[in-house]
């Protein structure tokens, strides 16, 4: 079946906005006003995964690029990254469980929660300007609760 | 090679709970997602819902606040639990082997059990 | 939920017969389209799984094509063993639904 998107900002519970630091890193930070534009609108494709009445699996691309958030292994630990693909064959409703996030929804928060390493969640820092990355753990100093705005 | 079998009471009352055993071989439950599926006599089949390998449940709707399914890893079984049953429950219960193939087949069913009647009467 | 069209109901044929069921879907459901042989008394058989794939072991005589909301089931001859019920079922997104079933009986 031909996949379904939408178009959206995240941010994080501290609102923290999320930006492109450098070709393939996101980093969190507090914007305001017209800096506002400058962070990035996500393509979030609904796709087949594990789903559940609780979970949602989405994957989650970058809008007009070829990036997509992907999990793996580096160094023996889950990490986040952003993956290029080819954009004739992407977004598709089968994609591979790298791409796939599980989306929980919790009292109007958002988690992402990587298909290929459960129970690790797409996190960013308290402190400003750092890397979005793959976080083990909930309820802890990292953020993993987000907010999400629809753009047309 | 693959085997599902379910297991439970074949008679259940009016207004309790219906529970049924699958115990499975030839997989391994943390791998691999099991529906449940039934069959009233002389009728068609209707997907209950299912458990995936990390445990995680996904139940249709029109049965979602009476049904439970849950696994025990160790013992290769996964459990049914229907409660509040009237005699529209009345039906073979089969448990099914999810094909759970990322970026291909990850809903389809290839293997199944043999069914088990269950008659819910007083 | 995708809704399942299955037709028909019932079908009389005879021995070496070429038939064909019809499977309609409410959503575009792309190749994930699959077809069971159920006899009486037995668990359904997966007969060709998503993507129009005949599962090993399965005659050749049986065979499904179609994309989208649209499917055919054909058995190009039958023979006395496919006397049974068939059933579709697509494995595009949850909850999985099933078609009412197709019976064919000896005419």
């Known amino acids: 079946a031909p996949v379904r998107s939408l178009h959206c900002t995240l941010r994080d519970a501290q609102l923290k906005s999320l930006v492109m630091s450098g070709p393939y890193e996101l980093k969190a930070l507090h914007l305001q006003g017209q800096d506002l534009e400058q962070q990035v609108v996500f393509s979030m494709s609904f796709v087949q995964g594990e789903e559940s009445n609780d979970k949602i699996p989405v994957a989650l691309g970058l809008k007009a690029k070829n990036l997509y958030l992907s999990c793996v292994l580096k160094d023996d630990k889950p990490t986040l990254q952003l993956e290029s693909v080819d954009p004739k064959n992407y977004p598709k409703k089968k994609m591979e469980k790298r791409f796939v996030f599980n989306k929980i929804e919790i009292n109007n928060k958002l988690e992402f929660e990587s298909a290929q390493f459960p129970n690790w969640y797409i996190s960013t820092s308290q402190a400003e300007s750092m890397p979005v990355f793959l976080g083990g753990t909930r309820g802890g100093q990292d953020i993993t609760d987000f907010t999400m705005q629809f753009v047309s | 090679e693959v085997q599902l079998q379910e297991s439970g009471p074949g008679l259940v009352k009016p207004s309790e709970t219906l529970s049924l055993t699958c115990t499975v071989s030839g997989f391994s439950l943390s791998d691999y997602g099991v529906s449940w599926i039934r069959q009233p006599p002389g009728k068609g089949l209707e997907w209950l819902g299912l458990i995936w390998g990390g445990g995680d449940t996904y139940y249709n709707s029109p049965l979602k606040s009476r049904l439970t399914i849950s696994k025990d890893n160790s013992k290769s079984q996964v459990s049914l639990k229907l409660s509040s049953v009237t005699a529209a429950d009345t039906a073979v219960y089969y448990c099914?082997?999810?094909?759970?193939?990322?970026?291909?087949?990850?809903?389809?069913?290839?293997?199944w059990g043999q069914g088990t009647l269950v008659t819910v009467s007083s | 939920d995708t809704q399942m069209t299955q037709s028909p109901s019932s079908l009389s044929a005879s021995v070496g017969d070429r038939v064909t069921i019809t499977c309609i879907t409410s959503t575009d459901i792309d190749v994930d389209m699959n077809w069971y042989q159920q006899k009486p008394g037995k668990p359904p058989k997966l007969l060709i799984s998503?993507?129009?794939t005949l599962r090993p072991g399965v005659p050749s005589r049986f065979s499904s094509s179609g994309s989208g909301t649209d499917f055919t089931f054909t058995i190009s001859s039958l023979q006395p063993e496919d006397f049974a019920t068939y059933y579709c079922l697509q494995s595009d997104n949850l909850p999985l639904t099933f078609g009412q079933g197709t019976k064919l009986e000896i005419k």
């Open positions: 998503q993507g129009n």
């Open positions: 099914a082997k999810q094909r759970t193939l990322w970026g291909y087949d990850l809903y389809g069913m290839d293997y």
